[in-house]
Interface confidence: low
C-alpha cells in the first residue's frame, strides 16, 4: 500500500524519497513519474538524475534537498486537483532488478475559504530554495536530519526534522530511504 | 568570507600554453561546481569549462575541447584551467566562478576579478 | 546550444527611469535563467537566479520575471550606480550560454 501525502490546492507538495550514496558523489539515477512504478523505469516521467545531475525536469516539479546526499524528494509546486494520484520514486541501483521502487500517494484537497495566513504566503515563496538557499552549499545549508544507517532492502520512516519553523507544517513527517553500498 | 582569486594569465604565442589557477577561500569547492568563464575585449561573456570537484565531472565548451583542461586540488581549495594550443582568439580575461552542481540551480555567485590571457605573436 | 536573445543590445536612461531588459531563449529553459550585472574593469555580480528570485544584497528595484521562453529584468527606478551591462544567462543544459548583454548608458 502506498504511503499517504496531502497537500492543498495552490499549496506545494512534498513528496520524501531519499537514499545513501555509497561515497559522497557516487550517485545513483532516479526517477520520478506519475502513475505507480512499473516494471521498469517510471512512467510519465517528471523528473530524473544520473550519475552527476538532475538531467530532465518538467515545468513544477523540482529536488529541494542535496540530492547528491541522496534527498530526491519531489517538490510539486502550486498543485491542483489534477496532481492528486500515484507517483513512483524509483531508485536505480545498478544490476538486475536491483531498483528500489516506492509509491506515494497524493491527495490534493480543495483550499480552504478563508484566506491563507502570510505563513503559507511565505512558504510557497521560499519553498523552492528552501534547502538550497544561495550563498551556502550543501554541506552548509539547512537539511533534513542526518539519515539512519540501513541495509538496502530496509525501509525507515524519518520523521524529517525541518529547521525552518515556517516550512515545517507544511511537510508530511515521513519518508522512504534506503542505503547503498 | 567568500573570495576567489584567479591568476597565471600572462603573454603567450600561439600555439603556447598556459596554467590558470583559482584560489578558493571561505567556502569548500568539493560542495560546489567551480566554472572558468572568459570575456575577450568588448565582448560578452563566454562559459569555458566547469567542473565538479568531489566527482571529477568536467564540461567544456566546444571551442575549447580537447585544447583545454579543468581540473581541481581539493586540497588546496584551488581550481585550474590548463590551456594548450592557445590561439589569437583565446584572448581574453578569464573569470573563476563559484556555481552550484544541480544544473536548475547553476547560476554564478561569487566571481573572481578575473586574470588576463593575451595570445600573441 | 541554447541561444539567448537579448535586447536592446543599448539603451539610454535617466535617473528614476524604469528600464526592462529582455532575453529569449530558443528552446525551453524551464526557469533556469539568471542576470548579472557588470562594470567596466570589474567581474559580473548576480542579481537575480532561477528567473525571479532576488539574490542577497540585490536591491529589491531589480526583479526578475517569465513568460514561456522570455525573461525579463526590470529595474523599478534607476538609480546611479545602475548604469552597467546587463546579461542574461541559461543554466538549463551544458553549456551555459549568456545573452549578448545590455549596456545601459546615461540619457
Known amino acids: 500500500s502506498e504511503v499517504e501525502y496531502r497537500a492543498e490546492v495552490g499549496q506545494n507538495a512534498y513528496l520524501p524519497c531519499f537514499y545513501t550514496p555509497a561515497a559522497p558523489g557516487n550517485l545513483v539515477p532516479v526517477c520520478w513519474g506519475k502513475g505507480a512504478c512499473p516494471v521498469f523505469e517510471c512512467g510519465n516521467v517528471v523528473l530524473r538524475t544520473d550519475e552527476r545531475d538532475v538531467n530532465y525536469w518538467t515545468s513544477r516539479y523540482w529536488l529541494n534537498g542535496d540530492f547528491r546526499k541522496g534527498d530526491v524528494s519531489l517538490t510539486i509546486e502550486n498543485v491542483t486537483l489534477a496532481d492528486s494520484g500515484i507517483y513512483c520514486c524509483r531508485i536505480q541501483i545498478p544490476g538486475i532488478m536491483n531498483d528500489e521502487k516506492f509509491n506515494l500517494k497524493l491527495v490534493i484537497k480543495p483550499a480552504k475559504v478563508t484566506p491563507a495566513p502570510t505563513r503559507q504566503r511565505d512558504f510557497t515563496a521560499a519553498f523552492p530554495r528552501m534547502l538550497t538557499t544561495r550563498g551556502h552549499g550543501p554541506a552548509e545549508t539547512q537539511t533534513l536530519g542526518s539519515l539512519p544507517d540501513i541495509n538496502l532492502t530496509q525501509i525507515s520512516t524519518l520523521a524529517n526534522e525541518l529547521r525552518d519553523s515556517r516550512l515545517a507544517n507544511d511537510l508530511r513527517d515521513s519518508g522512504a530511504t534506503i542505503r547503498i553500498g | 568570507e567568500v573570495q576567489l582569486v584567479e591568476s597565471g594569465g600572462g603573454l603567450v604565442q600561439p600555439g603556447g600554453s598556459l596554467r590558470l589557477s583559482c584560489a578558493a577561500s571561505?567556502?569548500?569547492?568539493?560542495?560546489?561546481?567551480i566554472h572558468w568563464v572568459r570575456q575577450a575585449p568588448g565582448k560578452g561573456l563566454e562559459w569555458v569549462a566547469d567542473?565538479?570537484?568531489?566527482?571529477?565531472?568536467?564540461d567544456y565548451a566546444d571551442s575549447v575541447k580537447g585544447r583545454f583542461t579543468i581540473s581541481a586540488d581539493t586540497s588546496k581549495n584551488t581550481a585550474y584551467l590548463q590551456m594548450n594550443s592557445l590561439r589569437a582568439e583565446d584572448t581574453a580575461v578569464y573569470y573563476c566562478?563559484?556555481?552550484?552542481?544541480?544544473?536548475?540551480?547553476?547560476?554564478?555567485?561569487?566571481w573572481g576579478q578575473g586574470t588576463l590571457v593575451t595570445v600573441s605573436s | 546550444d541554447i541561444q539567448m536573445t537579448q535586447s536592446p543590445s543599448s539603451l539610454s536612461a535617466s535617473v528614476g527611469d524604469r528600464v526592462t531588459i529582455t532575453c529569449r531563449a530558443s528552446q525551453d529553459v524551464n526557469t533556469a535563467v539568471a542576470w548579472y550585472q557588470q562594470k567596466p574593469g570589474k567581474a559580473p555580480k548576480l542579481l537575480i537566479y532561477?528567473?525571479?528570485f532576488l539574490y542577497s544584497g540585490v536591491p529589491s528595484r531589480f526583479s526578475g520575471s517569465r513568460s514561456g521562453t522570455d525573461f525579463t529584468l526590470t529595474i523599478s527606478s534607476l538609480q546611479p550606480e545602475d548604469f552597467a551591462t546587463y546579461y542574461c544567462q541559461q543554466h538549463y543544459t551544458t553549456p551555459p550560454t549568456f545573452g549578448q548583454g545590455t549596456k545601459v548608458e546615461i540619457k
Open positions: 571561505g567556502f569548500n569547492i568539493s560542495n560546489y561546481a
Open positions: 567542473i565538479t570537484p568531489d566527482g571529477g565531472y568536467t
Open positions: 532561477s528567473a525571479s
Open positions: 566562478a563559484r556555481g552550484y552542481v544541480y544544473r536548475m540551480w547553476d547560476s554564478f555567485d561569487y
